[in-house]
Amino acid sequence: HSDGIFTDSYSRYRKQMAVKKYLAAVLGKRYKQRVKNK
């Protein structure tokens, strides 16, 4: 996930936000799956 060639603060911010969103979605799916399997 290189996400482009820009290293300015806005590009870094958008990349960080994307990672957070992605992790939240993945963890959310895992949590739902765990609840479903109980």
Partner: antibody
Framework: SVEESGGRLVTPGTPLTLTCTAS????????MGWVRQAPGKGLEWIGD?????TTDYASWVNGRFTISRTSTTVTLKMTSLTTEDTATYFC????????WGPGTLVTVSS | AAVLTQTPSPVSAAVGGTVTIKCQSS????????LAWYQQKPGQPPKLLIY???TLASGVPSRFKGSGSGTQFTLTINGVQCDDAATYYC???????????FGGGTEVVVK
Amino acid sequence: SVEESGGRLVTPGTPLTLTCTASGIDLSGYAMGWVRQAPGKGLEWIGDISTYGTTDYASWVNGRFTISRTSTTVTLKMTSLTTEDTATYFCARDYWLSLWGPGTLVTVSS
Amino acid sequence: AAVLTQTPSPVSAAVGGTVTIKCQSSQSVYDNNALAWYQQKPGQPPKLLIYAASTLASGVPSRFKGSGSGTQFTLTINGVQCDDAATYYCLGGYDDPADNAFGGGTEVVVK
């Protein structure tokens, strides 16, 4: 380079999917954005998609448009189209929109 | 959504002269510098000139200069050439990307 396709004449309410493909660059390593421009008007930011597949949209989109991606393409799915959506649609690379395609024209008319 | 207000069109300049285009945002951009400038010629897609308020994009001539911070930004073209006749747009990036928006554009006419 990047190139858009899928633009055509549709009637109001018809869904339409636009596709952005690349030659000579690996799209999967870049965030990609969509921008539109109505005939004779200015540019309008639609939204973008990160390399992780997470998306952000302009507030005016109101859930009518969806951006998604595969390893080789980026798509813009549009629903509930109205005549106001008539425009040339561009895809562009990076959050700063550093490399643009030539655009694809979408005409919404009854 | 943010509103970006640009210098009204058209702006006229003589070859070799200087053009100044202003872009004012209704709210501060991210980190006070998340603003880009684009050049668009008729029938062509836009081209990135400046990003992060003042950083020149790859391959862009040094006669283009971006400045400003927060809500007020300026694009200056020094030693204007005929090839600079185009419409110029600013784009603001914000804490909430849902606010991201372009300015209305400023047409530059070169005499």
